[in-house]
């Protein structure tokens, strides 16, 4: 109630002779600050004096008097909150009640605290969980109801007297609620810890033994088993007998059932501690163990590997990889069940022994077409030689080999013929499925691997074919050697280099671009008349009469080819000039007279000049000289001169006679 002082501290404190005691304490006075504090040992109230009697361990008064005990007992509190006390050292006779007599200006209070001091250090107390199972982590707790700042202690864990490796966590509490030292140890007990003694040892700061507590571990665990086998190496041959015995070395709680397992599977009707295997077969090879159960669970023995030895079984061959591509690597593996494992192998290819191959694997770094076939092997161990199994087939795939293009036609082939070619090959795997031809053309393939060229061109020089499966193999090109009449026949002037002038030496060449066969004959013709049979047609001195249309013909055994007509043009100065007169060489005066300068020239005359009987040039330059009206004085001899790019020519004189008209005669 509100008339009480409020105190908080542990109800009882524990210590032992020579140790110390630390009393954590808080208070709240009813009014004002603390003015007087006396610590009594076993105080008793004296009704007569209305005061407390008892040994005064500590006294704090206004006048400051302090008893001799003051050095051993210390008040570590203050005037309003803290009432913590320390007794160091503490003695056996300090056991009992401590009375804290508190006085303020108007109020008084007696607070009692129990002190339990033993003669020797009291033991700590080990706390265990209700059940401990193997391999399950547990926390072991060692608790001591003591802690004092002036007296350091330590708690150490021991297992069968040997310090435990695991790290313990020690904690202390010196609070108004509790005073203790506690050590916690996390620990995963094994079945072998069952029945072992765990000790928590109290030691002083120097590690000197003070007291301890011990417990015996009760570790629940599955049965622990030992398996024994006869023969001890567990290696037998088919037909031998084997005995296995299961011994329980530990079980907590007691075991209930027994069974045997092979390769993890329970053996039926085998529920005793002895397993007898009579006349074993190779199928009985495997890992054996016994299993014994209790309430915790089943326990298994170590496995015994029973090896029933036998000669190799018929072998099989595994191929990595089939089909194989030529040039790739291939590995063959001989598989044969045997115990012990085979030590030697014999390999066969198509029934023939492969020399030098004695290992389980055969590695061929680059496979070739002739490596195709059946591979088999025989395995051998100390007990004998196995049988050759059925073998495995290696399929080696490769592009078509030795591809050739064959011309089926009788030779020679002539331009315009129909040519048939076939594409042949030596071998192929997989089979050839298609063919390709070079160059490409609008040709027909009447059947697979056959090419028909209708109306073969003169320029179909070479053809190559490819036979294709997964890959294409090309044949070397074959020459068709098509024979044809000479081609591109033309006339070519080889001299002179410039235009032909009359009198020049002239050579014409009959050219052609190609001919097959090469042997040819030449023919020259002009206006249907044969001129020569050489490749050249020569003129030592060309005349205008040689001008005209020329053709040359070239022929071989296949046929003949004519050039386009070629015009031979001869350039010459004007010739055969003559003056013709119209209407005649006798003309009446007053009429019209026309003189014409006629000539033969190549190129045509470009410029005319007229002359009179005095060789005087007249101011006329056209082909025709027109006199109108003609006069008697015009009578006389005239001549003309013609000029072209080659030269000049002149005509002979032609006489014009102009006679008087009747009128003139009449006038006279």
């Amino acid at each position: 109630d509100s008339s009480k002082w409020v105190f908080e501290h542990p109800e009882t404190l524990y210590a032992w002779e020579g140790a110390c005691v630390w009393i954590p304490c808080t208070y709240r006075a009813l009014d004002g600050d603390l003015e007087s504090f006396i610590l009594f040992h076993n105080p008793e109230y004296n009704k007569n004096t209305s005061k407390f009697d008892g040994t005064r361990l500590y006294e704090s008064t206004k006048d400051g008097k302090v008893p001799s005990e003051q050095k051993r007992v210390q008040f570590l509190g203050d005037k309003n909150k803290n009432c913590t006390l320390s007794i160091h050292p503490v003695h056996l006779n300090d056991s009992g009640q401590l009375g804290l007599r508190m006085e303020s200006k108007t109020e008084k209070w007696m607070e009692r605290i129990h002190l339990n001091v033993s003669e020797r250090p009291f033991p700590p107390h080990i706390q265990l969980p209700p059940e401990i199972q193997e391999s399950q982590e547990v926390t072991l707790t060692c608790l001591l109801n003591f802690s004092c700042y002036g007296y350091p202690i330590q708690l150490q864990w021991l297992l069968e007297g040997v310090p435990m490796r695991q790290a313990a966590v020690t904690s202390t509490s010196l609070t108004i609620k509790s005073v203790f030292t506690r050590s916690e140890l996390k620990f995963s007990p094994q079945w072998s810890h069952h029945g072992k003694i765990v000790t928590c040892q109290l030691q002083d700061a120097d590690g000197k033994f003070l007291s301890n507590d011990t417990v015996q571990l009760n570790v629940k665990h599955t049965p622990k088993l030992e398996i024994k086998v006869t023969p001890s190496d567990a290696i037998v041959r088919e037909g031998d007998s084997v005995t296995m015995t299961c011994e329980v070395s530990s079980s907590n709680p007691e075991y209930t059932t027994v069974s045997w397992l092979k390769d993890g599977t329970s053996l039926k009707k085998q529920n005793t501690f002895t397993l007898n295997l009579r006349e074993v077969t190779k199928d009985q090879s495997g890992k054996y163990c016994c299993q014994v159960s209790n309430d915790v669970g089943p326990g298994r023995s170590e496995e015994v590997f029973l090896q029933v030895q036998y000669a190799p079984e018929p072998s099989t061959v595994q191929i990595l990889h089939s089909p194989a591509v030529e040039g790739s690597q291939v590995e063959f593996l001989c598989m044969s069940l045997a115990n012990p494992l085979p030590t030697n192998y014999t390999w066969y290819h198509n029934g023939k022994e492969m020399q030098g191959r004695t290992e389980e694997k055969v590695h061929i770094p680059k496979i070739l077409p002739w490596h195709a076939g059946t591979y088999s092997c025989v395995a051998e161990n100390i007990l004998g030689t196995g049988q050759r199994g059925p073998g495995a087939e290696l399929d080696v795939q490769y592009p078509p080999k030795k591809v050739t293009t064959v011309i089926q036609n009788p030779m020679p082939i002539r331009e315009g013929d129909t040519v048939t070619l076939s594409c042949n090959y030596n071998s192929s795997n997989p089979s050839v499925t298609r063919y390709e031809w070079k160059p490409h053309g609008a040709w027909e393939e009447p059947s697979l691997g056959v090419l028909k060229i209708q109306n073969v061109g003169w320029d179909n020089t070479t053809i190559a074919c490819a036979a294709c499966n997964s890959w294409c193999s090309w044949a070397s090109p074959v020459a068709l050697n098509v024979q044809y009449a000479p081609r591109d026949v033309r006339v070519r002037k080889i001299k002179p280099l410039s235009e032909i002038h009359s009198g020049n030496s002239v050579s014409l060449q009959c050219d052609f671009s190609s001919s097959h066969p090469k042997e040819v004959q030449f023919f020259w013709e002009k206006n249907g008349r044969l001129l020569g049979k050489e490749s050249q047609l020569n003129f030592d001195s060309i005349s205008p009469e040689d001008a005209g249309s020329y053709s040359c013909w070239v022929n071989n055994s296949i046929g003949q080819t004519a050039s386009k007509a070629w015009t031979l043009e001869v350039l010459y100065a004007p010739r055969r000039l003559r003056v013709s007169m119209s209407p005649g060489d006798q003309v009446m005066e007053g009429k019209s007279a026309t003189l014409t300068c006629e000539s033969d020239a190549n190129p045509p005359v470009s410029h005319y000049t007229w002359f009179d009987w005095n060789n005087q040039s007249l101011p006329y330059h056209s082909q025709k000289l027109r006199l109108e009206p003609v006069k008697v004085q015009h009578s006389g001899a005239y001549w003309c001169q013609g000029t072209n790019s080659v030269g000049k020519g002149r005509s002979p004189l032609s006489t014009l006679t102009v006679y008087y008209s009747p009128e003139t005669i009449g006038r006279r």
């Epitope: 030529e326 040039g327 492969m354 020399q355 030098g356 191959r357 004695t358 290992e359 055969v362 590695h363 061929i364 770094p365 680059k366 070739l368 077409p369 490596h371 490769y398 080999k401």
Partner: antibody
Framework: QVTLKESGPGILQSSQTLSLTCSFS??????????VSWIRQPSGKGLEWLAH???????RYNPSLKSRLTISKDTSRNQVFLKITSVDTADTATYYC???????????????WGQGTTLTVSS | DIQMTQSPASLSASVGETVTITCRAS??????LAWYQQKQGKSPQLLVH???TLADGVPSRFSGSGSGTQYSLKINSLQPEDFGSYYC????????FGGGTKLEIK
Amino acid sequence: QVTLKESGPGILQSSQTLSLTCSFSGFSLSTSGMGVSWIRQPSGKGLEWLAHIYWDDDKRYNPSLKSRLTISKDTSRNQVFLKITSVDTADTATYYCARAPPPNWDEYYFDYWGQGTTLTVSS
Amino acid sequence: DIQMTQSPASLSASVGETVTITCRASGNIHNSLAWYQQKQGKSPQLLVHNAKTLADGVPSRFSGSGSGTQYSLKINSLQPEDFGSYYCQHFWSTPPFGGGTKLEIK
């Protein structure tokens, strides 16, 4: 009959590239399993295999020289070539080309050798 | 990688004697071993392939034997023309050639 003949520059300066040609006749490098190797021999020393080319254009090189070697072939012209970059005086040797005939299994060996071509590398 | 070790490196013998050169592989080479002879200034010549098959034209005094990792070349009744260098070779080893054996006249 089978013949092989090597040709090369004879003399090179350090750091130049060596180009060798092996011209052969009497066999085709398009035949399955066929191969040609280049092998060299410094004067007074043993044989050092350099590179091999197979019918299918697969190539093998001496690991210690691989970065400097290139082997190639021209099947139609019956020629095999070897290039060695950044030559040094240590590459002075006689260079041989040799034919490896198609094997039964994987037993490649050299049944025909060229007469060799000598290379001198000057520093 | 398989390695080839040839021994001895050199050998002195007299005409008419029998000599044996050995080649050891670091792994099983399944008889795929060849032997070559090389005379001074000449190209090597094939003597034996597939460990024991004599090459065309090789005299019968030469013989190859062995299996697995151990192989040898035996020359019976040495002739003057047999002196020179001998090499073993397994294509798939690195390097393919043995170090060589120099056979000299005693």
